[in-house]
Amino acid sequence: KKEDGESTAPTPRPKVLRCKCHHHCPEDSVNNICSTDGYCFTMIEEDDSGLPVVTSGCLGLEGSDFQCRDTPIPHQRRSIECCTERNECNKDLHPTLPPLKNRDFVDGPIHHR
Protein backbone atom coordinates (compact mmCIF):
# COMPACT_ATOMS: atom_id res chain seq x y z
CA LYS A 1 0.00 0.00 0.00
CA LYS A 2 1.38 3.43 -0.89
CA GLU A 3 1.68 6.01 1.89
CA ASP A 4 0.30 9.50 1.26
CA GLY A 5 2.72 11.59 -0.76
CA GLU A 6 4.83 8.60 -1.70
CA SER A 7 5.45 8.14 -5.43
CA THR A 8 6.77 4.61 -5.81
CA ALA A 9 6.49 3.22 -9.32
CA PRO A 10 3.78 0.60 -9.74
CA THR A 11 5.11 -2.98 -9.72
CA PRO A 12 5.45 -4.38 -13.24
CA ARG A 13 3.31 -7.41 -14.05
CA PRO A 14 5.36 -10.54 -14.79
CA LYS A 15 3.34 -11.12 -17.95
CA VAL A 16 1.45 -9.20 -20.60
CA LEU A 17 -2.30 -8.65 -20.07
CA ARG A 18 -4.80 -8.83 -22.94
CA CYS A 19 -7.82 -6.49 -22.89
CA LYS A 20 -10.88 -5.90 -25.03
CA CYS A 21 -10.69 -2.59 -26.86
CA HIS A 22 -13.50 -0.53 -28.34
CA HIS A 23 -13.15 3.04 -29.69
CA HIS A 24 -9.68 2.93 -28.13
CA CYS A 25 -7.71 0.29 -30.05
CA PRO A 26 -4.03 1.05 -30.64
CA GLU A 27 -2.31 0.17 -33.93
CA ASP A 28 -0.79 -2.96 -32.41
CA SER A 29 -4.18 -4.42 -31.44
CA VAL A 30 -5.68 -7.38 -33.30
CA ASN A 31 -9.36 -8.39 -33.43
CA ASN A 32 -10.25 -5.70 -30.87
CA ILE A 33 -7.73 -7.06 -28.36
CA CYS A 34 -4.87 -4.92 -27.08
CA SER A 35 -1.91 -5.83 -24.88
CA THR A 36 -0.51 -4.01 -21.88
CA ASP A 37 1.89 -4.12 -18.96
CA GLY A 38 -0.71 -2.25 -16.90
CA TYR A 39 -4.51 -2.38 -16.72
CA CYS A 40 -7.63 -3.08 -18.74
CA PHE A 41 -10.23 -0.32 -18.51
CA THR A 42 -13.79 0.53 -19.44
CA MET A 43 -14.91 4.15 -19.39
CA ILE A 44 -18.24 5.89 -19.86
CA GLU A 45 -18.44 9.61 -20.63
CA GLU A 46 -20.78 12.12 -22.19
CA ASP A 47 -20.04 13.25 -25.71
CA ASP A 48 -20.59 16.84 -26.86
CA SER A 49 -24.29 16.25 -27.34
CA GLY A 50 -24.75 14.74 -23.88
CA LEU A 51 -24.99 11.12 -25.07
CA PRO A 52 -23.16 8.41 -23.10
CA VAL A 53 -20.20 6.84 -24.95
CA VAL A 54 -18.48 3.70 -23.71
CA THR A 55 -14.83 3.07 -24.58
CA SER A 56 -12.56 0.28 -23.42
CA GLY A 57 -8.96 -0.71 -23.88
CA CYS A 58 -5.51 -0.91 -22.38
CA LEU A 59 -3.68 1.44 -20.03
CA GLY A 60 0.09 1.17 -19.82
CA LEU A 61 1.64 0.80 -16.39
CA GLU A 62 3.07 4.32 -16.48
CA GLY A 63 0.43 6.74 -15.22
CA SER A 64 -2.34 4.14 -15.00
CA ASP A 65 -2.57 4.43 -11.22
CA PHE A 66 -3.63 8.05 -11.68
CA GLN A 67 -5.92 7.37 -14.64
CA CYS A 68 -7.73 4.56 -12.84
CA ARG A 69 -8.35 6.71 -9.76
CA ASP A 70 -11.30 8.38 -11.50
CA THR A 71 -10.95 11.83 -9.97
CA PRO A 72 -14.02 13.95 -10.78
CA ILE A 73 -13.52 16.68 -13.37
CA PRO A 74 -15.81 19.74 -13.09
CA HIS A 75 -18.48 19.91 -15.82
CA GLN A 76 -17.37 16.53 -17.21
CA ARG A 77 -19.47 13.49 -16.49
CA ARG A 78 -17.34 10.41 -16.82
CA SER A 79 -16.44 7.28 -14.92
CA ILE A 80 -13.65 4.75 -15.42
CA GLU A 81 -13.09 1.29 -13.98
CA CYS A 82 -9.87 -0.73 -14.26
CA CYS A 83 -8.96 -4.35 -13.70
CA THR A 84 -6.05 -6.79 -13.97
CA GLU A 85 -7.38 -10.06 -12.54
CA ARG A 86 -7.64 -11.90 -15.87
CA ASN A 87 -7.43 -11.39 -19.63
CA GLU A 88 -10.30 -9.34 -21.09
CA CYS A 89 -11.52 -8.64 -17.55
CA ASN A 90 -12.83 -5.29 -18.77
CA LYS A 91 -15.64 -7.10 -20.63
CA ASP A 92 -17.27 -7.38 -17.21
CA LEU A 93 -16.78 -3.75 -16.14
CA HIS A 94 -19.89 -1.58 -16.29
CA PRO A 95 -19.12 1.94 -15.02
CA THR A 96 -22.08 4.30 -14.76
CA LEU A 97 -22.19 8.02 -15.28
CA PRO A 98 -22.16 9.96 -12.01
CA PRO A 99 -25.54 11.54 -11.24
CA LEU A 100 -26.23 15.04 -12.49
CA LYS A 101 -25.74 17.66 -9.80
CA ASN A 102 -28.30 20.51 -9.55
CA ARG A 103 -25.63 22.92 -10.73
CA ASP A 104 -25.22 20.91 -13.91
CA PHE A 105 -28.85 21.57 -14.82
CA VAL A 106 -28.20 25.29 -14.50
CA ASP A 107 -24.76 25.36 -16.14
CA GLY A 108 -25.50 22.68 -18.72
CA PRO A 109 -27.43 24.64 -21.37
CA ILE A 110 -25.11 27.63 -21.11
CA HIS A 111 -22.05 25.33 -21.30
CA HIS A 112 -23.32 23.53 -24.42
CA ARG A 113 -24.84 26.51 -26.22
Epitope: V16, P26, V30, S35, D37, G60, E62
Partner: antibody, heavy 116, light 112 residues
Framework: QVQLQQPGAELVKPGASVKLSCKAS????????MQWVKQRPGQGLEWIGE????????LYNQKFKGKATLTVDTSSSTAYMQLSSLTSEDSAVYFC?????????WGQGTTLTVSS | DVVMTQTPLSLPVSLGDQASISCRSS???????????LHWYLQKPGQSPKLLIY???NRFSGVPDRFSGSGSGTDFTLKISRVEAEDLGVYFC?????????FGSGTKLEIK
Amino acid sequence: QVQLQQPGAELVKPGASVKLSCKASGYTFTSYWMQWVKQRPGQGLEWIGEIDPSDSYTLYNQKFKGKATLTVDTSSSTAYMQLSSLTSEDSAVYFCARFGYYIEYWGQGTTLTVSS
Amino acid sequence: DVVMTQTPLSLPVSLGDQASISCRSSQSLVHSTGNTYLHWYLQKPGQSPKLLIYKVSNRFSGVPDRFSGSGSGTDFTLKISRVEAEDLGVYFCSQSTHVPFTFGSGTKLEIK
Protein backbone atom coordinates in the same frame (compact mmCIF):
# COMPACT_ATOMS: atom_id res chain seq x y z
CA GLN B 1 15.82 -23.28 -12.07
CA VAL B 2 13.18 -22.96 -14.77
CA GLN B 3 12.64 -26.20 -16.67
CA LEU B 4 10.22 -27.10 -19.47
CA GLN B 5 10.22 -30.84 -20.10
CA GLN B 6 9.02 -32.19 -23.43
CA PRO B 7 9.07 -35.74 -24.82
CA GLY B 8 11.90 -36.17 -27.34
CA ALA B 9 9.89 -37.63 -30.21
CA GLU B 10 6.45 -38.67 -31.43
CA LEU B 11 5.64 -40.80 -34.48
CA VAL B 12 2.06 -40.64 -35.78
CA LYS B 13 0.15 -41.63 -38.91
CA PRO B 14 -1.31 -39.15 -41.41
CA GLY B 15 -4.87 -38.09 -40.58
CA ALA B 16 -4.41 -38.84 -36.87
CA SER B 17 -4.15 -36.40 -33.96
CA VAL B 18 -1.41 -36.01 -31.38
CA LYS B 19 -1.25 -34.27 -28.00
CA LEU B 20 2.18 -32.87 -27.13
CA SER B 21 3.01 -32.13 -23.50
CA CYS B 22 5.23 -29.63 -21.71
CA LYS B 23 5.77 -29.96 -17.97
CA ALA B 24 6.92 -26.78 -16.24
CA SER B 25 8.93 -26.57 -13.02
CA GLY B 26 11.05 -24.06 -11.12
CA TYR B 27 8.51 -21.21 -11.24
CA THR B 28 4.85 -20.44 -10.59
CA PHE B 29 3.10 -21.96 -13.61
CA THR B 30 0.17 -19.51 -13.63
CA SER B 31 2.41 -16.41 -13.54
CA TYR B 32 3.56 -16.68 -17.16
CA TRP B 33 2.07 -17.43 -20.56
CA MET B 34 3.06 -20.64 -22.33
CA GLN B 35 3.78 -20.33 -26.03
CA TRP B 36 4.26 -22.95 -28.73
CA VAL B 37 6.65 -22.56 -31.65
CA LYS B 38 7.15 -24.74 -34.73
CA GLN B 39 10.52 -25.28 -36.40
CA ARG B 40 10.95 -27.10 -39.69
CA PRO B 41 14.43 -27.63 -41.19
CA GLY B 42 15.29 -24.67 -43.37
CA GLN B 43 11.98 -22.93 -42.59
CA GLY B 44 12.83 -20.98 -39.45
CA LEU B 45 10.59 -20.50 -36.43
CA GLU B 46 6.81 -20.07 -36.55
CA TRP B 47 4.67 -18.87 -33.64
CA ILE B 48 1.64 -21.13 -33.17
CA GLY B 49 -0.07 -19.45 -30.24
CA GLU B 50 -0.12 -18.98 -26.50
CA ILE B 51 -2.14 -19.83 -23.41
CA ASP B 52 -2.35 -18.08 -20.06
CA PRO B 53 -2.49 -20.89 -17.46
CA SER B 54 -4.17 -18.60 -14.91
CA ASP B 55 -7.42 -18.39 -16.93
CA SER B 56 -6.84 -20.68 -19.96
CA TYR B 57 -7.12 -17.65 -22.24
CA THR B 58 -5.67 -18.44 -25.67
CA LEU B 59 -4.40 -16.49 -28.66
CA TYR B 60 -3.59 -18.26 -31.92
CA ASN B 61 -1.72 -17.46 -35.07
CA GLN B 62 -4.52 -17.43 -37.67
CA LYS B 63 -2.47 -19.91 -39.71
CA PHE B 64 -2.79 -22.56 -36.96
CA LYS B 65 -6.44 -22.04 -36.02
CA GLY B 66 -8.22 -25.35 -36.45
CA LYS B 67 -4.88 -27.18 -36.49
CA ALA B 68 -3.65 -26.54 -32.94
CA THR B 69 -5.57 -26.51 -29.66
CA LEU B 70 -3.83 -25.31 -26.51
CA THR B 71 -4.81 -26.43 -23.01
CA VAL B 72 -3.28 -26.57 -19.54
CA ASP B 73 -3.55 -28.68 -16.41
CA THR B 74 -2.60 -26.39 -13.53
CA SER B 75 -2.61 -29.23 -10.98
CA SER B 76 0.39 -30.81 -12.74
CA SER B 77 1.84 -27.56 -14.20
CA THR B 78 1.60 -29.05 -17.67
CA ALA B 79 0.73 -27.39 -20.96
CA TYR B 80 -0.60 -29.34 -23.92
CA MET B 81 -0.91 -28.75 -27.63
CA GLN B 82 -3.18 -30.99 -29.68
CA LEU B 83 -2.54 -31.11 -33.41
CA SER B 84 -5.26 -32.58 -35.59
CA SER B 85 -5.62 -34.01 -39.14
CA LEU B 86 -1.88 -34.49 -39.38
CA THR B 87 -0.03 -34.37 -42.69
CA SER B 88 3.65 -34.45 -43.64
CA GLU B 89 3.61 -30.62 -43.42
CA ASP B 90 3.16 -31.00 -39.66
CA SER B 91 6.43 -32.93 -39.31
CA ALA B 92 8.64 -30.55 -37.33
CA VAL B 93 10.16 -29.80 -33.95
CA TYR B 94 7.63 -28.20 -31.58
CA PHE B 95 8.88 -26.09 -28.70
CA CYS B 96 6.98 -24.87 -25.68
CA ALA B 97 8.32 -21.67 -24.17
CA ARG B 98 7.71 -19.50 -21.12
CA PHE B 99 6.60 -16.01 -22.05
CA GLY B 100 6.14 -12.84 -20.01
CA TYR B 101 6.71 -10.07 -22.55
CA TYR B 102 9.20 -12.15 -24.56
CA ILE B 103 10.23 -15.80 -24.56
CA GLU B 104 12.65 -16.29 -21.69
CA TYR B 105 12.97 -20.07 -21.58
CA TRP B 106 12.38 -22.81 -24.15
CA GLY B 107 11.71 -26.53 -23.78
CA GLN B 108 14.05 -28.92 -25.57
CA GLY B 109 11.42 -29.56 -28.23
CA THR B 110 9.47 -32.59 -29.42
CA THR B 111 10.29 -33.95 -32.87
CA LEU B 112 7.00 -34.91 -34.50
CA THR B 113 7.18 -37.26 -37.47
CA VAL B 114 4.05 -37.85 -39.51
CA SER B 115 4.49 -40.98 -41.58
CA SER B 116 2.55 -44.08 -42.58
CA ASP C 1 2.03 -10.21 -40.30
CA VAL C 2 5.24 -8.37 -39.44
CA VAL C 3 8.11 -9.62 -41.60
CA MET C 4 11.52 -9.76 -39.90
CA THR C 5 14.40 -9.56 -42.38
CA GLN C 6 17.81 -10.61 -41.09
CA THR C 7 21.14 -9.98 -42.82
CA PRO C 8 23.47 -11.59 -43.54
CA LEU C 9 22.18 -15.18 -43.82
CA SER C 10 25.67 -16.48 -43.13
CA LEU C 11 28.47 -14.70 -41.30
CA PRO C 12 31.95 -16.26 -41.45
CA VAL C 13 34.23 -14.79 -38.72
CA SER C 14 37.60 -15.41 -37.15
CA LEU C 15 37.70 -15.97 -33.39
CA GLY C 16 38.30 -12.65 -31.63
CA ASP C 17 36.67 -10.65 -34.44
CA GLN C 18 33.64 -8.41 -34.03
CA ALA C 19 30.40 -9.65 -35.59
CA SER C 20 27.35 -7.60 -36.48
CA ILE C 21 23.88 -8.88 -37.45
CA SER C 22 21.08 -6.68 -38.76
CA CYS C 23 17.33 -7.17 -38.32
CA ARG C 24 14.68 -5.05 -40.04
CA SER C 25 10.95 -5.22 -39.41
CA SER C 26 8.25 -4.43 -41.97
CA GLN C 27 6.55 -2.11 -39.47
CA SER C 28 7.49 -0.24 -36.32
CA LEU C 29 7.99 -2.41 -33.24
CA VAL C 30 7.20 0.40 -30.80
CA HIS C 31 4.30 -0.90 -28.71
CA SER C 32 1.45 1.35 -27.57
CA THR C 33 2.94 1.15 -24.03
CA GLY C 34 6.14 2.74 -25.35
CA ASN C 35 8.18 -0.45 -25.10
CA THR C 36 9.92 -1.97 -28.12
CA TYR C 37 9.58 -5.74 -28.01
CA LEU C 38 12.51 -6.82 -30.18
CA HIS C 39 14.64 -9.70 -28.91
CA TRP C 40 17.64 -11.82 -29.94
CA TYR C 41 18.15 -15.59 -29.51
CA LEU C 42 21.00 -18.00 -30.20
CA GLN C 43 20.31 -21.59 -31.26
CA LYS C 44 23.17 -24.06 -31.23
CA PRO C 45 22.92 -27.30 -33.27
CA GLY C 46 20.54 -29.82 -31.68
CA GLN C 47 19.48 -27.36 -28.95
CA SER C 48 16.57 -25.04 -28.30
CA PRO C 49 17.06 -21.28 -28.73
CA LYS C 50 18.40 -19.29 -25.77
CA LEU C 51 17.52 -15.68 -25.00
CA LEU C 52 20.44 -13.25 -25.34
CA ILE C 53 18.92 -9.75 -25.55
CA TYR C 54 15.39 -8.58 -24.75
CA LYS C 55 13.65 -5.29 -25.53
CA VAL C 56 16.36 -4.16 -27.98
CA SER C 57 19.31 -3.75 -25.63
CA ASN C 58 18.86 -5.59 -22.33
CA ARG C 59 21.17 -8.55 -21.73
CA PHE C 60 19.42 -11.58 -20.24
CA SER C 61 20.87 -13.01 -17.02
CA GLY C 62 24.14 -14.88 -17.56
CA VAL C 63 24.74 -13.44 -21.03
CA PRO C 64 28.33 -12.13 -21.42
CA ASP C 65 28.79 -8.39 -21.94
CA ARG C 66 30.44 -8.95 -25.32
CA PHE C 67 26.85 -9.19 -26.62
CA SER C 68 25.04 -5.89 -27.17
CA GLY C 69 21.85 -4.84 -28.92
CA SER C 70 20.82 -1.50 -30.36
CA GLY C 71 18.32 0.12 -32.70
CA SER C 72 14.82 1.59 -32.75
CA GLY C 73 11.60 1.58 -34.74
CA THR C 74 12.26 -0.88 -37.56
CA ASP C 75 16.06 -1.17 -37.61
CA PHE C 76 18.01 -3.25 -35.08
CA THR C 77 21.52 -4.63 -34.64
CA LEU C 78 23.17 -7.34 -32.56
CA LYS C 79 26.91 -6.97 -32.01
CA ILE C 80 29.38 -9.49 -30.61
CA SER C 81 32.55 -7.61 -29.71
CA ARG C 82 34.99 -10.56 -29.64
CA VAL C 83 33.64 -13.81 -31.06
CA GLU C 84 34.40 -16.95 -29.06
CA ALA C 85 33.98 -20.58 -30.15
CA GLU C 86 30.90 -20.97 -27.92
CA ASP C 87 29.14 -18.15 -29.83
CA LEU C 88 28.81 -20.19 -33.01
CA GLY C 89 25.28 -21.11 -34.06
CA VAL C 90 22.19 -19.50 -35.58
CA TYR C 91 21.02 -16.10 -34.31
CA PHE C 92 17.35 -15.13 -34.57
CA CYS C 93 15.65 -11.81 -33.99
CA SER C 94 12.04 -11.88 -32.83
CA GLN C 95 9.25 -9.41 -32.21
CA SER C 96 6.47 -9.64 -29.62
CA THR C 97 4.84 -6.27 -30.30
CA HIS C 98 2.35 -7.49 -32.91
CA VAL C 99 0.29 -10.68 -32.93
CA PRO C 100 1.19 -13.05 -34.51
CA PHE C 101 4.70 -12.88 -33.09
CA THR C 102 7.31 -13.42 -35.77
CA PHE C 103 10.98 -14.39 -36.11
CA GLY C 104 13.79 -13.55 -38.48
CA SER C 105 15.01 -16.33 -40.77
CA GLY C 106 18.28 -16.62 -38.85
CA THR C 107 21.96 -15.75 -39.30
CA LYS C 108 24.51 -18.57 -39.11
CA LEU C 109 27.69 -17.49 -37.38
CA GLU C 110 30.53 -19.78 -38.47
CA ILE C 111 34.32 -19.95 -38.46
CA LYS C 112 36.04 -18.39 -41.48
